[in-house]
């Protein structure tokens, strides 16, 4: 069994929901390791998942600090077992991530309807406030005191019996719509920040219909 | 030149609080961790924990954790070891190092304390 | 936490002879260091990533091995070489050492 070279990591991927942030690369390792260092622009490169076989690091606890700053991070590879390390003058083989700046780029988790409640020929529904990993004054903040009124909720109504949709859209977590008494309706909705360029619409909460346990209904 | 200079040999009575120090120079100090490292008398190495200067986060053997504190202060580039009540237990040498990879190795010379009532 | 074993505890050897020195982990390990420690002097570290010689090194010592078992080799053995060994994981947290191997001249 001869040496084989220390390889650069490459494919570095951020994969980010709901500020969950993990960064991902290739390969699977053979006798090397690797170590991951985030920075922001102006910071010191932290190391982090120390000497690790696995490809994956999450790094959520370091981009939620700030999550509006904007992070690089590298991949060192560094020989573990009978290898040639291929850096020069014995420093480490190493890749840059991507830039990722969370308040822009984490995706938006799936929203999901947390009740629905009629009366007479209104509904108000409302959405779940997810919890996110971000923290302010040692407690965990929702979606939207992060986001504020840069995100809204579409809302998609339909009645049971038919297929036509109607929308409505929130800058809050609730929707108060019109309905026909009697009626049966099916909601579901969509977590967007308008204001992005990539990203911008988390997919479709499962599809909640009246007649369910989530419903209250009051003549 | 990268060097790192641990405070000078402390004799204590149990019960005693106490706080060593290491001053890191020649290099960024808030860009490495620093880990300490325990050596009883006559005895093998132990990995206490390390600490990243530049926010404070700690990682701590358990084995530590109601024990001993890691802190720094990053305007003078020193971190601290400190225990709020010593044990003859904690008789030892106490080494600063800073997390490298590879060749790069820098130790403080080390910390004798000795607990005696 | 990781357990490090190393044998043996202590080694008197004649100057030019083989000296092998074994870690076993009580489970599976990926990065192995070792560490040369001198009476009154901090450890220096010797071999890492479980086979690179450190710098100033001299290349009659080497190290090997994987998953749970590991090795240091002098293979002949020089009076600057009186010492105590340790080894090192830094696969998982803790980090633990082993408990030291002293090797004495003859």
């Known amino acids: 069994s001869g040496t084989t070279n220390t390889v650069a990591a490459y494919n570095l991927t951020w994969k980010s929901t709901n500020f969950k942030t993990i960064l991902e690369w290739e390969p699977k390792p053979v006798n090397q390791v690797y170590t991951v260092q985030i920075s922001t622009k102006s910071g010191d490169w932290k190391s982090k998942c120390f000497y690790t076989t696995d490809t994956e690091c999450d790094l959520t606890d370091e981009i939620v600090k700030d999550v509006k700053q904007t992070y690089l991070a590298r991949v060192f590879s560094y020989p573990a077992g009978n290898v040639e390390s291929t850096g020069s003058a014995g420093e480490p083989l190493y890749e840059n991530s991507p830039e990722f700046t969370p308040y822009l780029e984490t995706n938006l988790g799936q929203p999901t309807i947390q009740s629905f409640e009629q009366v007479g020929t209104k509904v108000n529904v409302t959405v779940e406030d997810e919890r996110t990993l971000v923290r302010r004054n040692n407690t965990f903040l929702s979606l939207r005191d992060v986001f504020g009124k840069d995100l809204i909720y579409t809302l998609y109504y339909w009645k049971s019996s038919s297929s036509g949709k109607k929308t409505a859209k929130t800058n809050t977590n609730e929707f108060l719509i019109d309905v026909d008494k009697g009626e049966n309706y099916c909601f579901s909705v969509q977590a967007v920040i308008p204001s992005r360029t990539v990203n911008r619409k988390s997919t479709d909460s499962p599809v909640e219909c009246m007649g369910q346990e989530k419903g209250e209904f009051r003549e | 030149e990268v060097q790192l200079v641990q405070s000078g040999a402390e004799v204590k009575k149990p019960g005693e609080s106490l706080k060593i120090s290491c001053k890191g120079s020649?290099?960024?100090?808030?860009?490495?961790?620093m880990n300490w490292v325990k050596q009883m008398p006559g005895k093998g190495l132990e990995w206490m924990g390390m600490?990243?200067?530049?926010?404070?986060?700690?990682r701590l053997n358990q084995k530590f954790k109601d024990k001993a504190t890691l802190s720094v202060d990053k305007s003078i580039s020193t971190a601290y070891l400190q225990w709020s009540s010593l044990k003859a237990s904690d008789t030892a040498m106490y080494y600063c190092?800073?997390?490298?990879?590879?060749?790069?190795?820098?130790w403080g010379q080390g910390t004798t304390v000795t607990v005696s009532s | 936490e990781i357990v490090l074993t190393q044998s043996p505890d202590f080694q008197s050897v004649t100057p030019k002879e083989k000296v092998t020195i074994t870690c076993s982990a009580s489970?599976?390990?990926?990065?192995m260091n070792w560490y040369q420690q001198k009476p009154d002097q901090s450890p220096k570290i010797w071999i890492y990533?479980?086979?690179n010689l450190a710098s100033g090194v001299p290349s009659r010592f080497s190290g090997s091995g994987s998953g749970t078992d590991f090795t240091l080799t002098i293979n002949s053995l020089e009076a600057e070489d009186a010492a105590t060994y340790y080894c090192?994981?830094?696969?998982?947290?803790?980090?633990?050492f082993g408990g030291g191997t002293k090797v004495e001249i003859k």
């Open positions: 020649g290099y960024s100090f808030t860009s490495y961790w």
């Open positions: 600490i990243y200067p530049a926010d404070s986060e700690t």
């Open positions: 990533g479980i086979s």
């Open positions: 489970s599976s390990v990926s990065y």
């Open positions: 090192q994981q830094k696969s998982s947290f803790p980090w633990t």
């Open positions: 190092a800073r997390e490298d990879y590879g060749s790069s190795d820098y």
